[in-house]
């Protein structure tokens, strides 16, 4: 069973996040400089004619792009997709961004720019001020704050109104750690490293980021092929050879926004035996409530039994018991020459009265915890109340 | 960069440490090897140390050696030293390339011990 | 334990020519395979990680190949400077150990 229960479907991770309904409100929304007061942050709003009808930076975006739109969700999204247009002014607006670049935050403090799948950064935007320009972010971004920093190629103005959509990021996860994936050499390389990590990548040990191992996207039976257009073999996945691991497992450590109960981990494997893929033998799961704190209470063990012999991707689900923890570390025992993972998520409940905790490494940011969920949230819903989500589909207009 | 220091002449049995000093990171994300030389021979791996504190030693240095760690030194103690002992001791510090793969990237310029009555 | 043991010991070829050095590890490695260059009172030289993978700022005139067992780092257009002894190593994230080396001699 290939089924990620209790996982996000990147698909329906579509919902406008409140630009243009208004339920971010002014307060969330800043800048670097403004034109004007009737240019200022609060009139980026896509659709608005707030003001003189946008976002305009007082500065020059040419050649420094040091300019930037600040939206903070007051707490972790997924973003999808993202969309702008530029000044309105009664229809008499002539300014708009014909690329803009983003970069994006969890924890206020460590700031990551944004880049698709083969590593460009920069955007295509609008035309004209008044079209709406959706971007299909590939990969897609979880974030509590996102910067826009419009571009030009010459001096002259540009403006900016936005809309981001996504959806509430339930599973808490902040970053993971783990070791660097590997190639596999078959008769062509099969690149299993985790392209999208944003984290640090160091000795061996990418940590501090999240990646392709939480991106919703599930791995096909074939490891070779991709859900994904123009990438290389391998895309999907992240892998490890047990050759270059003496003690005969891959480790990983799992940070979390706050304290949580964990009932499950779901993690989605290959198990293309016939090229050396296989399931993992067993897991093993430590928890601990603080970074600098102890491991608790006994590790949890699960050995893997089921159908090894066949050799299509699954999801494994490895009971944790309802540990309540903030850290996980698990180690994933070799049955094979190769781990294969696509996809890790949890399933856990947030125990009542635990204060976010951002980022074990930083101190807890000013402005944390927030205050109140956005009104169109509650703590069980992924997306708002009464929208439809932007659909995903050939022809629409996303770039 | 890396530099060992502690090399000198001792005496059979002696216990010695040498201390590798990592300058420009952290050594907590790094596995770090010892390696030695004898004069005139190859290189002998003796132990590496993990980013979580984990030890491998080669099967001949089990009970030899004891490597130990901070985020800036890497110690190596030699227990009860042998005139076979006598060698350049390097630290090392693994890495990985574009395949995903570790290899040593980065060397000290090695500490020579000589065991001798 | 692991034993990779390294073949010839030492070879000798001219300037220009190409020489080849066979590494062998007692059971299979995959693709966990490095190799260094020393020169003579010098720290070694990291070349190739990952069989293939060749480290920064080495020329392309090094080459390795090979899978499991079996192994080989290939020099061709050989030039003086290469003149140095050989390792190959096996490097997962733990027991690392070394081939006995080949000296390479150019003439």
């Known amino acids: 069973d290939a089924d990620m229960k209790g996982h996000f479907d990147p698909a329906k991770c579509r919902y406008a996040l409140g630009m243009q309904d208004r339920t971010i409100p002014d307060s969330d929304i800043s800048a670097s400089s403004s034109w004007s007061d009737s240019t200022a942050a609060r009139h980026s709003r896509l659709e608005s004619s707030d003001g003189d009808g946008a976002w305009c930076p007082a500065g020059s975006v040419f050649p420094k792009e040091e300019e930037y739109l600040q939206v903070d969700l007051q707490r972790l999204h997924l973003v999808a997709l993202v969309g702008t247009q530029g000044r309105h002014a009664g229809g008499l607006g002539k300014e708009f961004s014909r690329s803009y670049r983003l970069r994006y935050s969890r924890d206020g403090r460590r700031w990551m720019g944004w880049k698709d799948r083969w590593g460009q950064e920069v955007i295509s935007g609008n035309e004209d001020p008044e079209g709406v320009v959706l971007k299909d972010l590939g990969p897609p971004m979880v974030a509590r704050l996102v910067r826009f920093y419009p571009r030009a190629d010459r001096v002259m103005s540009v403006c900016l109104r936005v809309e981001l959509y996504g959806c509430l990021w339930r599973d808490g996860l902040l970053s993971y750690t783990a070791p660097v994936g590997q190639t596999m050499y078959l008769s062509e390389a099969v690149y299993l490293n985790d392209s999208t990590y944003d984290g640090h990548t160091v000795g061996g040990l990418q940590y501090g980021g999240l990646g392709q191992l939480a991106d919703g996207v599930v791995g096909l039976d074939d490891f070779r092929k991709s859900q994904e257009l123009r990438v290389w073999p391998g895309y999907d996945y992240v892998g490890w050879s047990n050759h270059s691991f003496s003690s005969g497992y891959v480790e990983m450590e799992f940070e979390f926004d706050r304290l949580r109960a964990f009932q499950a981990m779901q993690v989605h494997c290959n198990n293309m035996h016939t090229l050396g893929a296989r399931l993992p033998g067993g897991v093993e799961c430590r928890f601990r409530r603080g970074p600098a704190m102890a491991w608790e209470g006994e590790p949890m063990r699960h050995n893997l039994g089921g159908n090894l012999g066949d050799p299509r991707a699954r999801a494994v689900s490895v009971p944790l018991g309802g540990r309540v923890a903030r850290f996980l570390q698990c180690r994933f025992l070799f049955a094979g020459p190769w781990l294969l993972f696509s996809e890790i998520s949890f399933i856990s409940d947030v125990v009542n009265n635990s204060s976010p905790a951002l980022g074990g490494t930083f101190p807890p940011a000013p402005w944390w915890p927030p205050g109140p969920p956005p009104t169109n949230f509650s703590s069980l819903e992924l997306e708002p109340r009464g929208q439809q989500p932007v659909a995903k589909a050939e022809g629409s207009p996303t770039a | 960069s890396l530099e060992e220091s502690g090399g000198r002449l001792v005496t059979p049995g002696t216990p010695l440490t040498l201390t590798c000093t990592a300058s420009?990171?952290?050594?907590?994300?790094?596995?770090m090897l010892w390696v030695r030389q004898a004069p005139g021979e190859g290189l002998e791996w003796i132990g590496t140390?993990?980013?979580?504190?984990t030890t491998y030693y080669a099967s001949w240095a089990k009970g030899r050696f004891t490597i130990s760690k901070t985020s800036t030194t890497v110690d190596l103690k030699m227990t009860s030293p042998t005139t076979e002992d006598t060698a350049t001791y390097f630290c090392?510090?693994?890495?990985?390339?574009?395949?995903?793969?570790?290899?040593?990237?980065?060397w000290g310029p090695g500490t020579l011990v000589t065991v001798s009555s | 334990e692991l034993v990779m043991t390294q073949t010839p010991a030492s070879v000798e070829a001219a300037v220009g020519g190409t020489v080849t050095i066979k590494c062998q590890a007692s059971?299979?490695?995959?693709?966990?395979l490095a190799w260094y260059q020393q020169k003579p009172g010098q720290r070694p030289k990291l070349l190739i990680s990952?069989?293939?993978d060749l480290a920064s700022g080495v020329p392309s005139r090094f080459k390795g190949s090979g899978s499991g067992t079996e192994f080989t780092l290939t020099i061709s257009d050989l030039e003086c400077a290469d003149a140095a002894t050989y390792y190959c190593?096996?490097?997962?994230?733990?027991?690392?150990?070394f081939g006995g080396g080949t000296e390479v001699v150019v003439k």
């Open positions: 190593q096996y490097i997962p994230y733990g027991s690392s150990p």
């Open positions: 990952g069989v293939f």
């Open positions: 059971q299979s490695i995959g693709s966990v």
């Open positions: 140390i993990s980013y979580g504190d």
């Open positions: 420009g990171f952290s050594l907590n994300r790094y596995y």
């Open positions: 090392a510090r693994a890495d990985t390339g574009d395949n995903g793969y570790l290899g040593l990237q980065l």
